[in-house]
């Protein structure tokens, strides 16, 4: 009885994320066989979120709003072992859209999510940013610097990368 | 004030080249991202590029990419625009102007006079 | 490319009556309560010249009797008493995403 209860949980869970997700891939946490995490296939996995890389070219705002849709936000960074996991998988010769931006024009960056934006850990390349047109940050490889962060404008189409909490049923 | 003033327009052969000028007075021009835009006799308005005001980020339509390049000279407070491979459809008044963020997107707020391209042979 | 569709594609209005000019964006240029769309006024033989931007936003200088509307997708011009100096062709743009791009205009003429 209590198999049966948690199994109709699990599939009314997963009957929520249907619509944006049709499949998702799941992994044992721990070692109770009750607790899975899920991200959507074929997102990838690092920690508690799953990241999803698009590929498709659009601004800032059509990035966060495509990210929205699918249950995310763009890409928040919160320490260096997160960013070190993210730019596996990402191509040296394409800019990635954070969901980091200062559309006041006041360098006062904020996170999408509200995160509070911490200078100490930030990873601009060196001399960024360095514009106040340029409101919406990305991430990009140098050769000089290897990967970091630039300021461009909002409106130039780049890739972006999107985060969401693993799903637990 | 505010002037902006274009030069460098002409008459040019399909396949020519010509560089346009515009030359800023009244703002602080290497604070400034600047634009071009274009308007083909009787039509409407066509964006055309934009570059940074530091001059490392360069943005074109489709319809000019790898024909034409946007540059500038902050210590001369000039916009240039290199126009190579032209077309016939490339006839147009050309604008240049400055660029004003707005939250996540911008305006185009003030304006030269223009100056005339026309390709014919 | 986001698609900027004016209509009408000209108008002709009495002196001190009211003008409208409707805009539609082939797709939403709305984030986060702001809408990136701006509107220009060209005289013959000038530059344009920016009167409203992000909608609804006068710019400065512009006489008020000039309004702008809108959100989403749909998006309007209003000059609400005519003045003989409004003679002019009216273009809205987006800036919502490059390319940007600009309706195909709009001329206003006394009738």
């Known amino acids: 009885n209590f198999m049966y209860s948690k199994t109709v949980k699990r599939l009314s869970k997963l009957r929520e994320y249907q619509q944006y997700h049709p499949s998702l891939t799941c992994v044992m946490e721990g070692k109770d066989i009750e607790d899975w995490s899920c991200c959507p296939t074929p997102w990838t996995s690092f920690q508690s979120s799953c990241y999803f890389i698009s590929t498709g070219m659009q601004s800032w705002t059509k990035s966060q709003k495509n990210c929205s849709v699918m249950g995310a936000d763009l890409v928040v960074i919160n320490t260096r072992e997160e960013q070190d996991f993210i730019i596996q998988n990402l191509k040296r010769n394409s800019s990635y859209f954070l969901g980091l931006s200062d559309p006041g024009g006041r360098r006062h960056w904020q996170w999408v999510d509200q995160t509070p934006y911490n200078e100490n850990v930030t990873f601009w390349h060196s001399g960024e940013p360095n514009n106040l047109d340029e409101r919406c940050a990305i991430i990009n490889f140098r050769s000089s610097e290897e990967w970091g962060w630039n300021d461009i404008h909002c409106h130039v189409p780049q890739k972006s990368i999107c985060k969401m909490k693993k799903i637990y049923i | 004030e505010v002037q902006l003033l274009e030069s460098g327009g002409g008459l040019v052969q399909p396949g020519g080249s010509l560089r346009l000028s515009c030359a800023a007075s009244?703002?602080?021009?290497?604070?400034?991202?600047m634009s071009w835009v274009r308007q083909a006799p009787g039509k409407g308005l066509e964006w055309v590029a934009t570059i940074n005001s530091g001059g490392d980020n360069t943005y074109y339509p489709d319809s000019v990419k790898g024909r034409f390049t946007i540059s500038r000279d902050n210590s001369k407070n000039t916009l240039y625009l290199q126009m190579n491979s032209l077309r016939a459809e490339d006839t147009a008044v050309y604008y240049c102007?400055?660029?004003?963020?707005?939250?996540?997107?911008?305006?185009?707020?003030?304006w030269g006079q223009g100056t005339t391209v026309t390709v014919s042979s | 490319d986001i698609v900027m569709t004016q209509s009408p594609d000209s108008l002709a209005v009495s002196l001190g009556e009211r003008a409208t000019i409707n805009c539609k964006a082939s797709?939403?240029?709305?984030?986060?309560?702001?809408?990136?769309v701006n509107w220009y006024q060209q005289k013959p033989g000038q530059p344009p010249k920016l009167l409203i931007y992000?909608?609804?936003n006068l710019e400065s200088g512009v006489p008020d009797r000039f309004s702008g509307s809108g959100s989403g997708t749909d998006f309007t011009l209003t000059i609400s008493s005519l003045q003989a100096e409004d003679v002019a062709v009216y273009y809205c743009?987006?800036?919502?995403?490059?390319?940007?791009?600009f309706g195909g205009g709009t001329k206003v003429e006394i009738k």
């Open positions: 797709q939403s240029v709305d984030y986060d309560g702001n809408s990136y």
């Open positions: 743009q987006q800036s919502d995403e490059d390319p940007w791009t």
């Open positions: 009244g703002i602080t021009f290497s604070t400034y991202t």
């Open positions: 102007a400055t660029y004003r963020p707005y939250y996540y997107g911008s305006v185009l707020d003030y």
């Open positions: 992000g909608a609804s």
